[in-house]
C-alpha cells in the first residue's frame, strides 16, 4: 500500500508524524495544494505540545496551517473536530478583518511571530508546514 | 542512471483514445509525483497533468480535464495517461517527468508523438 | 491562471557572449520559477529551479535571478552547446504553465 513506515527526506518525524516546513511562501490554497501532492496535508495542531514543536521550527515568521473558515465554520483540513480541539489564538483572534483593502475578511489561519495563531487573508503570500501520519500498523509493538 | 521511457503514442482519430505509459528506473518511483508534459510540433511546452507519488491526488490542465486521466502503478514503477476524447488540438510530443520539491521538473523522458488526425 | 512572458522571443549571439532573457510573470510567484533548455528534437533539461537555485550537473556560467513578477536567465559566455531554446515555468500555483521560450542562435 501507500502507507509510510518512516519520513521521507528532508522531513522531520515527531510523534508518529511526519512534517515538512517550507522556506518559500504560497497563498494558503497554493500551500494546500503542494501538501495534498506529498500525499499530505497542512499541518493540524491538536496538542500544545505539538504547538510548540511546530513553533521551534518555524521560528517568528507568518506560517500557514490548515485550519480555515472560508466555507462558513473553522475546520481543519484533515476532519479534526475544531469546537472541541486545541486552540491557540491570538487575544481578540480571529475577528474577519475587512480593513486590510484587499476585498473580503480573513479565512485562513497561520502561526504568527510569536506562534499564536491569527486569521488573515488567504492570498497573502506565506510559508507553511504540511504534515503526514505514519502508518499506524507500524506503531504496534512487535509480538513477542 | 535515472530514466524515464515514454510509450504508447501513434495515430488516432478523432473522438479516439489513447494510452500513453512511461517506465521509471534508478529512484523510487513511489515517492515522487510525477507528471505529464506536452509540446504540439513547432510549439512550446505546456504542462498537461500531476500525480502525487502514493496516487492520492491528481490535477490537470483545464484543456485535458475531463479527458485524461493520470494514474500510476508504483508496483511496476509504471506512469499512465488515459486520453480519451482525442482532439486534434492533442496532437504534440508527450513527455513525462519527475517533480523535485521547488515543484520544477528534474528528469524527462524522450517524449512519445501523439498525433490525432482523420 | 498565471500567464508567463518571455524576452526576447530571439536573439542572434556569439561565442562568448553575455546573454540575458527575461522572464514576467502576470502576478507575483515569489521564486518559484525554473529554466529549462531544450535542443531541436530532444526533451527538455532544467537548468535553474527556485529562481536562482543551479541544478545539479549544470554549468556555472548559468545562473538565474529575480523574485515576484521579474526573472532573469543569464549565460555569462555563451558556448557552442548553449545554442538552444529556453523556457521558464512558474511553479507557484495550478496549472503550471511555461513561458512562450526564446530561442538562441548563432550570430
Known amino acids: 500500500g501507500s502507507e509510510r513506515t518512516c519520513c521521507p527526506v528532508n522531513w522531520v518525524e515527531h510523534e508518529r508524524s511526519c512534517y515538512w516546513f517550507s522556506r518559500s511562501g504560497k497563498a494558503w490554497a497554493d500551500a494546500d495544494n503542494y501538501c495534498r501532492l506529498e500525499d499530505a496535508h497542512l499541518v493540524v495542531v491538536t496538542s500544545w505540545e505539538e504547538q510548540k514543536f511546530v513553533q521551534h521550527h518555524i521560528g517568528p515568521v507568518n506560517t500557514w496551517m490548515g485550519l480555515h473558515d472560508q466555507n462558513g465554520p473553522w475546520k481543519w483540513v484533515d476532519g479534526t473536530d475544531y469546537e472541541t480541539g486545541f486552540k491557540n489564538w491570538r487575544p481578540e483572534q480571529p475577528d474577519d478583518w475587512y480593513g486590510h483593502g484587499l476585498g473580503g475578511g480573513e479565512d485562513c489561519a497561520h502561526f504568527t511571530d510569536d506562534g499564536r495563531w491569527n486569521d488573515d487573508v488567504c492570498q497573502r503570500p506565506y510559508r507553511w508546514v504540511c504534515e503526514t501520519e505514519l502508518d499506524k500498523a507500524s506503531q504496534e509493538p512487535p509480538l513477542l | 542512471e535515472v530514466h524515464l521511457l515514454e510509450s504508447g503514442g501513434g495515430l488516432v482519430q478523432p473522438g479516439g483514445s489513447l494510452r500513453l505509459s512511461c517506465a521509471a528506473s534508478g529512484f523510487t518511483f513511489s515517492s515522487y509525483a510525477m507528471s505529464w508534459v506536452r509540446q504540439a510540433p513547432g510549439k512550446g511546452l505546456e504542462w498537461v497533468s500531476i500525480?502525487?507519488?502514493?496516487?492520492?491526488?491528481?490535477y490537470y490542465a483545464d484543456s485535458v480535464k475531463g479527458r485524461f486521466t493520470i494514474s500510476r502503478d508504483n508496483s511496476k514503477n509504471t506512469l499512465f495517461l488515459q486520453m480519451n476524447s482525442l482532439r486534434a488540438e492533442d496532437t504534440a510530443v508527450y513527455y513525462c517527468?519527475?517533480?523535485?520539491?521547488?515543484?520544477?521538473?528534474?528528469?524527462w523522458g524522450q517524449g512519445t508523438m501523439v498525433t490525432v488526425s482523420s | 491562471d498565471i500567464q508567463m512572458t518571455q524576452s526576447p522571443s530571439s536573439v542572434s549571439a556569439s561565442v562568448g557572449d553575455r546573454v540575458t532573457i527575461t522572464c514576467r510573470a502576470s502576478?507575483?510567484?515569489?521564486?518559484?520559477l525554473a529554466w529549462y533548455q531544450q535542443k531541436p528534437g530532444k526533451a527538455p533539461k532544467l537548468l535553474i529551479y527556485?529562481?536562482?537555485s543551479l541544478q545539479s550537473g549544470v554549468p556555472s556560467r548559468f545562473s538565474g535571478s529575480g523574485f515576484g513578477t521579474d526573472f532573469t536567465l543569464t549565460i555569462s559566455s555563451l558556448q557552442p552547446e548553449d545554442f538552444a531554446t529556453y523556457y521558464c515555468?512558474?511553479?507557484?500555483?495550478?496549472?503550471?504553465?511555461f513561458g512562450p521560450g526564446t530561442k538562441v542562435d548563432i550570430k
Open positions: 527556485a529562481a536562482s
Open positions: 515555468q512558474q511553479a507557484n500555483s495550478f496549472p503550471f504553465t
Open positions: 502576478q507575483g510567484i515569489s521564486d518559484w
Open positions: 517527468a519527475k517533480r523535485t520539491p521547488s515543484d520544477a521538473f528534474d528528469i
Open positions: 500525480l502525487s507519488g502514493g496516487g492520492k491526488t491528481t
